[in-house]
């Protein structure tokens, strides 16, 4: 699987999950989240050659098409597969609230 | 929705479904499919700015991150959303078989 266990410990050039730290204020302009100040969101990057963790029959077809037509702009793209939630603290008036923001952290990628 | 109805009738620059015809022999090297000789597979293409048909909370975060960090390589990608099957005819010996190949045609796209 193209997950953090494999990708963070390898020098994989193809589609894989990469490390990305996002600071809520600096990178998003969000001031409403009190904690954490930022988080390891990660992101997906890398080419999607034929047979590389392809998502659907269509992805396989498109990767093969791209192999036969290298100059084509039609190609599968490396995108998130497994996402995890992020717990946050924000304030309603003076009262702190804890909430889970769903689908915030990328754990693995796929070629779609 | 970024579907064929909208995308094929507009000059949309952002993520949208685009027309692509794939010839099984020429483009994939497949000789086993008797009919059709090719099909309109379509593909997804175009940038994914903030708020443009974003798939998950993560996609929104990443698009906003990209807006604040324009040079970053981390950005959402335009990928298939709705896929449809393709009926094909192939031969087993001299006997024709009809089968549906699932997830073969892109009907709409999303930013993931």
């Amino acid at each position: 699987a193209l997950d953090t266990n494999y990708c963070f410990s390898s020098t994989e050039k193809n589609c894989c999950v990469r490390q990305l730290y996002i600071d809520f204020r600096k990178d998003l302009g969000w001031k409403w989240i009190h904690e954490p100040k930022g988080y390891h969101a990660n992101f997906c990057l890398g080419p999607c050659p034929y047979i590389w963790s392809l998502d659907t029959q269509y992805s396989k077809v498109l990767a093969l098409y791209n192999q036969h037509n290298p100059g084509a702009s039609a190609a599968p793209c490396c995108v998130p597969q497994a996402l995890e939630p992020l717990p946050i603290v924000y304030y309603v008036g003076r009262k702190p609230k804890v909430e889970q923001l769903s689908n915030m952290i990328v754990r693995s990628c796929k070629c779609s | 929705a970024l579907d064929t109805n909208y995308c094929f009738s507009s000059t949309e620059k952002n993520c949208c479904v685009r027309q692509l015809y794939i010839d099984f022999r020429k483009d994939l090297g497949w000789k086993w499919i008797h009919e059709p000789k090719g099909y309109h597979a379509n593909f997804c293409l175009g940038p994914c700015p903030y708020i443009w048909s974003l798939d998950t909370q993560y996609s929104k975060v990443l698009a906003l991150y990209n807006q604040h960090n324009p040079g970053a390589s981390a950005a959402p990608c335009c990928v298939p959303q709705a896929l449809e099957p393709l009926p094909i005819v192939y031969y087993v010996g001299r006997k024709p078989k009809v089968e549906q190949l699932s997830n073969m045609i892109v009907r709409s796209c999303k930013c993931s």
Partner: antibody, heavy 117, light 102 residues
Framework: QVLLVQSGAEVRKPEASVKIFCKAS????????MNWVRQAPAQGFEWMGQ????????NYNGKFKGRLTLTADTSTNTAYMELSSLRSTDMAVYYC??????????WGQGALVTVSS | EIQMTQSPSSLSASPGDRVTITCRAS??????LAWYQQKPGKVPKLLIY???NLADGVPSRFSGSGSGTDFTLTISSLEPEDAATYYC?????????FGGGT
């Protein structure tokens, strides 16, 4: 590299005020929270507050409410901590420390504040 | 405010020993915890951030584990230079309180 350089030791009388500076270099001063922490002699640590130099936002430990003022000068990349109405229990080493990724990763060298009549 | 309880308050061990220090939060802090090392007269040094991540330049014999309310700092094989006081600190809503030290 990241460097936080603090002002020197200070001696103050009870009820006086003290203002300590922390000059930052080697990173984007305006886009990282700066924390202030103190350590009384032979004691543990006490978090006092934090400031976001980019917009001046602050979070204070309620214990210091009304006595603690955190400011930042973005033109000189300097953070300031002012504590008023000093008492003997405020005698401590005061540290500035950069907030990063759920920790304080770089600390100033500390500034000793002595409160004595 | 969240209370951080560290144990033991002190310990004695020999070079090569495996040492474990624990930190308990009074409520769920998820993985928002850091560990520091302080030697006499010196500035604290970050060892572990986000409960399990080793800070830059810290020897791999140090490791952190846990989430929620219970956390552990482990030194797999003690070295003489590890003699110091160790503190935990939470980062889950201000004030960011510290443990009492080990």
């Amino acid at each position: 590299q990241v460097l936080l350089v603090q002002s020197g030791a200070e001696v103050r009388k009870p009820e006086a005020s003290v203002k300590i500076f922390c000059k930052a270099s080697g990173y984007s001063f305006t886009s990282s929270w700066m924390n202030w922490v103190r350590q009384a002699p032979a004691q543990g640590f006490e978090w006092m507050g934090q400031i976001y130099p980019g917009d001046g936002d602050t979070n204070y430990n309620g214990k210091f409410k009304g006595r603690l003022t955190l400011t930042a000068d973005t033109s000189t990349n300097t953070a300031y901590m002012e504590l008023s109405s000093l008492r003997s229990t405020d005698m401590a080493v005061y540290y500035c420390a950069r907030h990063y990724d759920g920790s304080t990763d770089y600390w100033g060298q500390g500034a000793l504040v002595t409160v004595s009549s | 405010e969240i209370q951080m309880t560290q144990s033991p308050s002190s310990l004695s061990a020999s070079p090569g020993d495996r040492v474990t220090i624990t930190c308990r939060a009074s409520e769920n802090i998820y993985s928002n915890l850091a560990w520091y090392q302080q030697k006499p007269g010196k500035v604290p040094k970050l060892l572990i951030y986000a409960a399990t991540n080793l800070a830059d330049g810290v020897p791999s014999r140090f490791s952190g584990s846990g989430s929620g309310t219970d956390f552990t700092l482990t030194i797999s094989s003690l070295e003489p230079e590890d003699a110091a006081t160790y503190y935990c600190q939470h980062f889950w809503g201000t004030p960011y309180t510290f443990g009492g030290g080990t």
